[in-house]
Structure formats: structure tokens, C-alpha cells
Interface confidence: medium
């Protein structure tokens, strides 16, 4: 893959170390994007599009910031709704959310993942759940994204304002991974309800995506190397 579209293609090219790599959306040189690739988790090939780990980056931001992205891809960041939409428009992607609290880890994966375009308010589309964290994201299925200055939820109140984040809020959330770091007050922190409830802020979270067929392709490559 001379111009990899995602981290899975980098991995197929032999780039086995996790780190920052350029990807080229739809294989076009003009659409270059620097992303963090997780090459080790569950077969690797993941584009990490969100990470929370120390509270150094403010995630209570406006629509414009969430559209284009913010932060440092080697630390805490949000890749940007436009980028997430463009990546997931390349084909079928799957989603994985990794969470850690000290030595305790949990994950949630969904066999489909896409985010619609700006005209459709970046609505979330996910498939079937698998994992150890419990399914807290399906509640948000089909919801548009909301920020403090773009209230697209179905609540009377402004969910983003109430819970100091930005998310695919409904009324309001089962999970709020862009909530306030370290905040244990009810529903205000980084929550995944079915794992740790709404009164615990998860210290480490990564959201990541990769082509759904990566496992199959990686398996074929391994087989071909054996002959």
C-alpha cells in the first residue's frame, strides 16, 4: 500500500510499532492526515481518534473545535468529526473503546462504526456490541453530536452544558467519554455507565477504529507467509 488509507494498511505494510503515521484518505496524496496507530491491541491496525489519560487537555469545547479536532495525537486528543466521517466513509469500519482504571481494564467493540457528515450533524451509527465493559453506547445510536454551542440532543436542558462535554447525547448519556477528567460528581466525568457507573471518572480511555475486514485480511497475509 504505497499510500495507506488507514492504520490497518500500514500494519500490512510491516509497520508493527504503535505510533504516529500519515494516512491518505481514499488513497489521495492531497488528503494526508497524521494519526496515532495502535498496532498491538487485538491484532492492531487501529486508528485512535480519542484519548483521555491525564486531564491536561480541555475537552469542554465548542462545535468548531470538535469538527476539526484538537490536542496532541501522542497525548490527549480528539481527531475531529470531519476526519472521523471521512475515514469511516472509506468502507466498513469497526469501533473499539479501551478503558483502564489502574490494573483493571475493559473494552467495548461494535462491528460497525460510522459518523455522518456535518449536514447530518455527525450522527453516530454503530453495530452489534461485544466486550467486557457492557453496552453503554447503543443508547446513543443514531444521535447527532452536541456541543455547548450546538444543542442537538432531545433533552429540555443542554446536555453538553450540563455534563461539561460534547457527545452524541440523547437525554442525556449512558457514556460521556468527552466529559470532565477526574470529575466524580454524578454524570459529569468520563463515564461508561455499564462498567463503572456515573459517579466514577475513568482515568484512561481510547476510542479507535479499523476496517472491519482487517482480521480476515491479516489472517490471509499470515497464511500466505507460511507457504
Amino acid at each position: 500500500f504505497p499510500h495507506p488509507q488507514d492504520c490497518a494498511q500500514h500494519l500490512m505494510n510491516g509497520d508493527t510499532l504503535s505510533g504516529v503515521y500519515p494516512i491518505f484518505l481514499n488513497g489521495e496524496l492531497s488528503q494526508k492526515l497524521q494519526v496515532y496507530c495502535d498496532m498491538t491491541t487485538d491484532g492492531g491496525g487501529w486508528i485512535v481518534f480519542q484519548r483521555r489519560q491525564n486531564g491536561q487537555t480541555d475537552f469542554f469545547r465548542k462545535w468548531a473545535d470538535y469538527r476539526v479536532g484538537f490536542g496532541n495525537v501522542e497525548d490527549e486528543f480528539w481527531l475531529g468529526l470531519d476526519n472521523i466521517h471521512r475515514i469511516t466513509s472509506q468502507g466498513r469500519y469497526e469501533l473499539r473503546v479501551d478503558m483502564r482504571d489502574g490494573q483493571e481494564a475493559a473494552f467495548a467493540s461494535y462491528d460497525r462504526f460510522s459518523v455522518e457528515d456535518s449536514r447530518n450533524l455527525y450522527k453516530l451509527r454503530i453495530g452489534s456490541y461485544n466486550g467486557t465493559a457492557g453496552d453503554s453506547l447503543s443508547y446513543h445510536q443514531g444521535r447527532p453530536f452536541s456541543t455547548e454551542d450546538r444543542d442537538n440532543d432531545v433533552a429540555v436542558t443542554n446536555c453538553a452544558m450540563s455534563y461539561k462535554g460534547a457527545w452524541w447525547y440523547k437525554n442525556c448519556h449512558r457514556t460521556n467519554l468527552n466529559g470532565k477528567y477526574g470529575e466524580s460528581r454524578h454524570s459529569q466525568g468520563i463515564n461508561w455507565y455499564h462498567w463503572k457507573g456515573h459517579e466514577f471518572s475513568i482515568p484512561f480511555v481510547e476510542m479507535k477504529m479499523r476496517p472491519y475486514n482487517h482480521r480476515l485480511m491479516a489472517g490471509r497475509k499470515r497464511q500466505s507467509l507460511q507457504f
Epitope: 452489534s128 456490541y129 453496552d135 447503543s138 445510536q141 433533552a155 429540555v156 437525554n171 454524578h186 454524570s187
Partner: antibody, heavy 120, light 107 residues
Framework: QVQLVESGGGLVQPGRSLRLSCAAS????????MHWVRQAPGKGLEWVSG????????YYADSVKGRFTISRDNAKNSLYLQMNSLRAEDTALYYC?????????????WGQGTMVTVSS | DIQMTQSPASLPTPVGDRVTITCRAS??????LNWYQQKPGKAPKLLIY???NLETGVPSRFSGSGSGTDFTLTISSLQPEDFATYYC?????????FGQGTKVDIK
């Protein structure tokens, strides 16, 4: 149109078993969680059990845990409730209800119910 | 389990009057609250979901409000077909629990 039809109710002795069925039509069955909710004669509503759209996750009220088993056959658009070790307090009208989501949330469509009477 | 407490239990009301039913959750539930209407011999019917959203086909005289622990169902002008029992239900966590019901009958 969306429809839920329950069956399998009847008169049963304490300690015996009964299996309720719910036939669904008019919607993509496996996209939605499904539930059983009961109502004892002259009383309020009590959620009994729920199951996710895929069937991978099941949920029970404490009052029936270990005695009742919820299941679904997505190929047949059917929901089931296997009720074992029945007690007099299980006597109720049992409703099958569709959720608005793939995980337990809100019941937007209800069947007309099937009556279960536990008595010696 | 989350306890849901409805009041009043019974509400005799003349046609045309405004009706207010309250529901209190024993713990914070954001806006995860639904209201159902049940007429004698019939299955419950969803009226309002997520505290304030009117289900399709439900008349606009019904409205819901509240968040956190305190919620209200309001019927702006009671019609003869509105005489029924109303239940609140929390969908915040399983087991999903219902209030004990409020019977609205003719005064």
C-alpha cells in the same frame, strides 16, 4: 403495522412450569431489545425481564431471577419466557413489549397480554 | 433498585381542567423517565419518553418536564378519553421500575 401477540398463558399449579411466547411482526426484530412486563390483578406494572437485540445480554427482576429465563429466536421473530418454580405471586397478565433501542430503554409497543394464573 | 414514587394516587378531575401528576426517583436519573397511559382492559401506551418528548400520535395537550429526580406529567385540558391510569417509569438502569400509578377519573 407493528404488532406483538402473546400466547402460552393459562392455569398452572405452584411449583410447575409454563412457557410464554410472543410473535412479533412489522419491524426488524433483531434491531430492538424486548421485554416481559407483568400486571397482577388490580395492581400496577412490574418489569420482569429484558433481552438485547442480539440476544447476547439478558436482564431480570430480582423477584424472578433464577426461576425465569428470557430468550429470543430472531429468525422466527419470536420472544419467549420460560417460567419455572411458579408461585402464587406470579399470577398476572404478562405483556410482551418492544423497546425503542437495541438495549433496555423505553417500551414503545405492547402486546395485549396473556394471563398466567398460579393456583392449586 | 431505583424506587419511583408517584403522586397523587387518585385524581378526580372535571373535563377541561389542567392535570398535574408528579413522579420522584429515589436517585438521580438524568432525564431517563417515561410516562405511560393505561385504560381498563387495555395494554399500556407510551405517551412521553426521555422526560419531555411526545411520542408520535400523542395529542399536544400532554407534556412532560423535569430532570434529575423530580418529574411532572401535565395534561393542559383534560378530555373524556384521558380518563385512565398513568405510570412513570425510569429507564436509567435495570431493573426498570414503574411508579405505582395515578388514576385520573371523573369528578
Amino acid at each position: 403495522q407493528v404488532q406483538l401477540v402473546e400466547s402460552g398463558g393459562g392455569l398452572v399449579q405452584p411449583g410447575r412450569s409454563l412457557r410464554l411466547s410472543c410473535a412479533a411482526s412489522g419491524f426488524t426484530f433483531d434491531d430492538y431489545a424486548m421485554h416481559w412486563v407483568r400486571q397482577a390483578p388490580g395492581k400496577g406494572l412490574e418489569w420482569v425481564s429484558g433481552i438485547s437485540g442480539s440476544g447476547g445480554s439478558t436482564y431480570y427482576a430480582d423477584s424472578v431471577k433464577g426461576r425465569f429465563t428470557i430468550s429470543r429466536d430472531n429468525a422466527k421473530n419470536s420472544l419467549y419466557l420460560q417460567m419455572n418454580s411458579l408461585r402464587a405471586e406470579d399470577t398476572a397478565l404478562y405483556y410482551c413489549a418492544k423497546d425503542i433501542s437495541a438495549v433496555p430503554d423505553t417500551f414503545d409497543i405492547w402486546g395485549q397480554g396473556t394471563m398466567v394464573t398460579v393456583s392449586s | 433498585d431505583i424506587q419511583m414514587t408517584q403522586s397523587p394516587a387518585s385524581l378526580p378531575t372535571p373535563v377541561g381542567d389542567r392535570v398535574t401528576i408528579t413522579c420522584r426517583a429515589s436517585q438521580y436519573i438524568q432525564g431517563f423517565l417515561n410516562w405511560y397511559q393505561q385504560k381498563p382492559g387495555k395494554a399500556p401506551k407510551l405517551l412521553i419518553y426521555d422526560a419531555s418528548n411526545l411520542e408520535t400520535g400523542v395529542p399536544s395537550r400532554f407534556s412532560g418536564s423535569g430532570s434529575g429526580t423530580d418529574f411532572t406529567l401535565t395534561i393542559s385540558s383534560l378530555q373524556p378519553e384521558d380518563f385512565a391510569t398513568y405510570y412513570c417509569q425510569q429507564s436509567y438502569s435495570t431493573p426498570q421500575t414503574f411508579g405505582q400509578g395515578t388514576k385520573v377519573d371523573i369528578k
